[in-house]
């Protein structure tokens, strides 16, 4: 008996060939001997089967002795043995229809689980293997689960169903809803304007939801909400903003926030959460702000940084075009009785300057100038 695998919703063509290359009488029946279709001369006739409106044949092939049964919009329950009667012969074809669907939606939040469920006919024992867009293979039976979806899991998942040495391939497009970056860090001199951007890693026609930026300043004992907002069809509207700092928010995507000036009291880390309509759970992006200040008080030149810096970062004070006078893996450095000239405060990581602030030290009889 010939075995043919089909996909739910697809069209399948079951072949039936006579030895004579001409149009002769044929019938297709199911395992209950109920006629599906056949011919009467050059006319197609249909029987009382459930397939009535979905069954067809190709009249153009009859003259060549080919009498296919075409079943459109396949259903799992179409799985059956189909019998073609032609020239006093019976050709049997076993059709097995499979369906593979994602648990709920194919748009899932980062960190959520993807469950793929195989619908299969009774009595079948298929195996399934799926390959993710990043080349990860998962195997299973009726269900396959992938926990903690990552951004790289976005794309086409290719799943192969194996039964009776035959295989059928399914392609499922999965969109992982996430921010492009899980975390970002902004380095600013005191007084500079700060721009925070939160680009999304996906595009959808209509994006609706709401969000909040919750901030933990390094100097503060508790965290607080800096801004809350709504998103309607990609248009951003601010709901509530804290009075200090007075953040501004862009009206279009990508989500964009502006802090008028970087101040030590704002240095710290924030968490932007975004809830999307019809999705349970939220997207998160961490953002960090590091603020630098260089000051001269009497005979002491000081450079300080506030915010989440890594212990390997180096803070240095140097006179322009000279070697660093002081360089430490600390958040504050100073030079006593600095000589006159343009001093640079540098925050660097393995030699790469992340932040720089210049301060002009005048001869001792005058006051310092901050450029």
């Amino acid at each position: 008996k010939k075995v043919v695998l089909g996909k739910k919703g697809d069209t399948v063509e079951l072949t039936c060939t006579a030895s004579q290359k001409k149009s002769i009488q044929f019938h297709w029946k199911n395992s209950n001997q109920i006629k599906i279709l056949g011919n009467q001369g050059s006319f197609l006739t249909k029987g009382p089967s459930k397939l009535n409106d979905r069954a067809d044949s190709r009249r153009s092939l009859w003259d060549q002795g080919n009498f296919p049964l075409i079943i459109k919009n396949l259903k799992i329950e179409d799985s059956d043995t189909y019998i073609c009667e032609v020239e006093d012969q019976k050709e049997e074809v076993q059709l097995l229809v499979f369906g593979l669907t994602a648990n709920s939606d194919t748009h899932l939040l980062q960190g959520q689980s993807l469950t793929l469920t195989l619908e299969s006919p009774p009595g079948s024992s298929p195996s399934v293997q799926c390959r993710s867009p990043r080349g990860k293979n998962i195997q299973g039976g009726k269900t396959l689960s992938v926990s903690q979806l990552e951004l790289q899991d976005s794309g086409t998942w290719t799943c192969t169903v194996l039964q009776n040495q035959k295989k059928v391939e399914f392609k499922i497009d999965i969109v992982v809803l996430a921010f492009q970056k899980a975390s970002s860090i902004v380095y600013k001199k005191e007084g500079e304007q700060v721009e925070f951007s939160f680009p999304l890693a996906f595009t959808v026609e209509k994006l609706t939801g709401s969000g909040e930026l919750w901030w933990q300043a390094e100097r503060a004992s508790s965290s607080k909400s800096w801004i809350t907002f709504d998103l309607k069809n990609k248009e951003v509207s601010v709901k509530r903003v804290t009075q200090d700092p007075k953040l501004q928010m862009g009206k279009k995507l990508p989500l964009h926030l502006t802090l008028p000036q970087a101040l030590p009291q704002y240095a710290g880390s924030g968490n932007l959460t975004l809830a999307l309509e019809a999705k349970t759970g939220k997207l998160h992006q961490e953002v960090n702000l590091v603020v630098m200040r260089a000051t001269q008080l009497q005979k002491n030149l000081t450079c300080e940084v506030w915010g989440p810096t890594s212990p390997k970062l180096m803070l240095s004070l140097k006179l322009e075009n000279k070697e660093a006078k002081v360089s430490k893996r600390e958040k504050a450095v100073w030079v006593l009785n600095p000589e006159a000239g343009m001093w640079q405060c540098l925050l660097s990581d393995s030699g790469q300057v992340l932040l720089e602030s210049n301060i002009k030290v005048l001869p001792t009889w005058s006051t310092p100038v901050q450029p």
């Epitope: 609706t208 939801g209 709401s210 909040e212 508790s222 009075q243 809830a275 309509e277």
Partner: antibody, heavy 119, light 107 residues
């Protein structure tokens, strides 16, 4: 530790006035919006009014508009509710709550003060 | 004003049971929804904010879901201290409004 303590409740005749106070401690009071919520005996919760950090924005439910006024004194870490033209249906426990939770949630509540309007 | 309708108004269950309370808003409120627990003679306590985020210190048996108009509070494996009243509240449009409450009773 965040603490909110209401006071000023009591028995008042219909048409009378009362001023409720809420003393806040354990957090930077001037950083938060604050709310009043009430609960009639055996009934559910009803949000009454709220006020922003510096008192420049105030919102209230229609049933108390023109009769109740919310205010705050950040120097004293205090929230107030001035209630005039009181009615029998205003009888309730009044809670002061901090809008300090994420997503505008009311994360800390006082123990409540009972206001009884009866002749 | 936005009407918040909770159902059921009361539910009987046993320790260890799973209980689901639903809250429906008369118009879309995105995820501006909180769930509170209130024990007799006590002030309400925040359980869930932003429709699905668990407030710090709240046991993980409590969970929230939904967005738009339909929301759910689920208590997995009810504990004796969970038999009390629960309220949903929207913070999308003034005036903030609460659901009428759901009482979880011992069967």
């Amino acid at each position: 530790e965040v603490q909110l303590v209401e006071s000023g409740g009591g028995l008042v005749q219909p048409g009378g006035s009362l001023r409720l106070s809420c003393a806040a401690s354990g957090f930077t009071f001037s950083d938060y919006w604050m709310s009043w919520v009430r609960q009639a005996p055996g009934k559910g919760l009803e949000w009454v009014a709220n006020i922003n950090q510096d008192g420049s924005e105030k919102y209230s439910v229609d049933s108390v508009k023109g009769r109740f006024t919310i205010s705050r004194d950040n120097a004293k870490n205090s929230l107030y509710l001035q209630m005039n033209s009181l009615r029998a249906e205003d009888t309730a426990i009044f809670y002061c709550a901090r809008e300090g939770g994420q997503w505008l949630a009311l994360d800390y509540w006082g123990q409540g003060t009972l206001v009884t309007v009866s002749s | 004003d936005i009407q918040m309708t909770q159902s059921p108004s009361s539910v009987s269950a046993s320790v260890g049971d799973r209980v689901t309370i639903t809250c429906r808003a008369s118009q879309g409120i995105s995820s501006w929804l909180a769930w509170y627990q209130q024990k007799p003679g006590k002030a309400p306590k925040l359980l869930i904010y932003g429709a699905s985020s668990l407030q710090s210190g709240v046991p993980s048996r409590f969970s929230g879901s939904g967005s738009g108009t339909d929301f759910t509070l689920t208590i997995n494996s009810l504990q004796p201290e969970d038999f009390t009243t629960y309220y949903c509240q929207q913070a999308n449009i003034f005036p903030w409004t609460f659901g009428q409450g759901t009482k979880v009773e011992i069967k």
